[in-house]
């Protein structure tokens, strides 16, 4: 008695697919595979397959059913923080070769990484013209201010809305200031946040307000405090710089905008007698913390002149280092003061028409605005590698 195995039904390729190998008939243990055209993928229902092979069984049936070759669907594109996405090919079209365009919210954000145009590729991922599968980035535009002209505020004037949108009020023990970098970092002075370095959550960070005591402000909380490793508390103010990482990104608007970091060419806008602007809620001439955000325009002072001013007692020799810059009037009267610490001394980059942080309010004479003495600021340009490393690492 002999029997021959029944041949299996001839495999009909699914639409947009083909069978291989093609045979006249398929008998016991013969197999075939299905390959889909570019832009189509093997699916068993909703489940994707990289490959498909069926084997002919002795009862003349295939051991598995035919899959489908379905057009690749990249799915709805991810939302872009501070941006939006537009369907170019057609409303809601997300299949192979469909095109979408990401864009950032105008005025306050600019697109980084690529041009925002993405295509649904055969691998099922939205892909930029540069081949990137990750989202573009909407980075806050820095250095925008309502002012068009170019810590410690003494002899200053009241700021108006949008003048210093990077200004941050730091409460937590004492009143201090800082400047917003990007949308989740604050640049400040090390001495202003030294006590909170191990208790970042104790810092109450406020922005988007002019009035120090106003209930209307944007609240931010600190995730971590990074103090420059070269800073020694109670032993001078060298390396008086710190970064605060916020636990959430803040929404950028005309009242909350980051300050720019100085470009390599920034020194050309920070020469002796160039005007910088310091802002804060520190002590005024009346001896009280300012209720309203104040600012003062002050010239950069020759470094040797400043060093000499702080060589005589009660200041120890070498108080002014190469990591500092000084600003103020020889005649006095205009200065930053206690409570302004950590705030930014900003300059207008006339090439980019953006404001950048040149200094951080650090220290000065006991009597603010004293003739022959100057406000001393951390020289930010010396710390760009340190700032960039911290921000990229964390």
């Amino acid at each position: 008695y002999t029997s021959t195995a029944q041949p299996c039904p001839y495999p009909m390729a699914p639409p947009n697919g083909h069978v291989s190998p093609v045979q006249a008939k398929y008998i016991l243990k013969d197999s075939f595979s299905i390959f889909c055209e570019t832009g189509y993928e093997l699916l068993q229902g909703h489940l994707p397959l990289k490959s498909f092979t069926a084997v002919c069984q002795k009862d003349g049936s295939w051991d598995r059913p035919m899959p489908a070759c379905s057009i690749v669907d990249c799915g709805p594109p991810d939302d872009l923080p501070s941006g939006r996405v537009e369907y170019i090919t057609g409303p809601g079209v997300t299949t192979y070769k469909a095109v979408i365009q990401y864009s950032c919210e105008e005025t306050f954000y600019t697109m980084k990484v690529n041009d925002g145009k993405y295509v649904c590729e055969a691998d099922g991922f939205w892909t930029s013209s540069k081949g990137e599968k990750s989202l573009p980035v909407c980075e806050p535009v820095c250095g925008l201010s309502a002012r068009t002209t170019g810590g410690r505020i003494y002899g200053g004037q009241k700021a108006k809305p949008g003048d210093f949108p990077w200004q941050v009020l730091i409460l937590g023990g004492t009143t201090a200031a800082g400047a917003l970098l990007y949308d989740n970092w604050v640049l400040t002075a090390a001495h202003a946040v030294y006590e909170q370095k191990h208790d970042a959550s104790a810092l109450d960070i406020r922005m988007g307000t002019l009035k120090r005591l106003s209930p209307h402000y944007t609240q931010a909380w600190s995730e971590a405090v990074f103090i420059h490793e070269g800073y020694t508390h109670d032993a001078g103010f060298d390396n008086d710089i710190a970064l605060i990482k916020l636990n959430n990104k803040v929404v950028i608007n005309s009242n909350i905008t980051p300050i720019c970091l100085p470009r390599k060419e920034a020194e050309s806008f920070m020469r002796t007698d160039d005007i910088g602007t310091a802002s804060g809620w520190g002590l005024t001439q009346r001896g009280f913390l300012a209720r309203n955000l104040m600012y003062v325009d002050i010239p950069i002072v020759d470094h040797q002149k400043c060093t000499a001013a702080y060589e005589k007692p009660p200041y120890p020799r070498g108080s002014v280092t190469a990591n500092m810059l000084c600003a103020g009037l020889e005649s006095g009267g205009k200065d930053s003061c206690r409570g302004d610490s950590g705030g930014a001394l900003v300059f207008l980059d006339s090439e980019t028409e953006r404001w950048f942080v040149g200094g951080i309010v650090s220290w000065g004479s006991m009597n603010c605005g004293e003739a022959g003495q100057y406000g001393v600021y951390t020289k930010v340009i010396n710390y760009i590698p340190w700032i960039e490393n911290i921000i990229s690492d964390f």
């Epitope: 229902g45 909703h46 990289k50």
Partner: antibody, heavy 116, light 107 residues
């Protein structure tokens, strides 16, 4: 033989994130198929949560889309579930699985309680 | 979402009987249905996929049939180890959805 094993904390506080790991042995998660997360509530109701495919593409249950993320570490042959803003309703036994295609394999499940 | 309805929560049977468990999809799912067996404290075990294809190692007393919206799992010669919960799953479209289950118990 293909084996899957779930791991992660058994207790999560409301509003926090639930994070689970599925370690796969006996088959590379990049070779083929879709690798799913499924959960079973106390009354035995099963819910498919989503998958990550061999290519790294994901598909999520729309009811969870705003809270769920499935990722993988191909070097460790692991895939992960993160479910944000959990409530007591997320208390369940969580399974990782390779469903249907090329054989059907499930982990033994890990019980997660959401409670303060 | 596609609703998979298993109208009978419980079914009583005896060893040696033939029993049919049914599952109805709220819309056409082709043949993209799996049948699972689950015992207390265990993960589900797949029996049938693509409506009628038996997974390897599954006894041939288990058979599946149906397409479109109506599906049946038949156990032709019930054994004591078959007393468990039986669930259907559609994997045709996102989201994959399970039936509520039918518990097979002794008369």
């Amino acid at each position: 033989d293909v084996q899957l094993q779930e791991s992660g904390p058994g207790l999560v506080k409301p509003s926090q994130s639930l994070s689970l790991t599925c370690t796969v042995t006996g088959y590379s998660i990049t070779s083929d198929y879709a690798w799913s997360w499924i959960r079973q509530f106390l009354r035995n109701k099963l819910e498919w949560m989503g998958y990550i495919s061999y290519s790294g593409r994901t598909s999520y249950n729309p009811s969870l889309k705003s809270r769920i993320s499935i990722t993988r570490d191909t070097s460790k042959n692991q895939f992960f579930l993160q479910l944000n803003s959990v409530t007591t309703e997320d208390t369940a036994t969580y399974f990782c699985a390779r469903l249907i295609t090329g054989g059907d394999y499930w982990g033994q499940g890990t019980s997660v309680t959401v409670s303060s | 979402d596609i609703v998979m309805t298993q109208s009978q929560k419980f079914m009583s049977t005896s060893v040696g009987d033939r029993v049919s468990v049914t599952c109805k999809a709220s819309q056409n799912v082709g043949i993209n249905v799996v049948w699972y067996q689950q015992k207390p404290g265990q993960s589900p075990k797949a029996l049938i996929y693509s409506a009628s294809y038996r997974f390897s190692g599954v006894p041939d007393r288990f058979t599946g049939s149906g397409s479109g919206t109506d599906f049946t799992l038949t156990i032709s010669n019930v054994q004591s180890e078959d007393l468990a919960e039986y669930l259907c799953l559609q994997y045709d479209i996102n989201p994959l959805t399970f039936g509520a289950g039918t518990k097979l118990e002794l008369k």
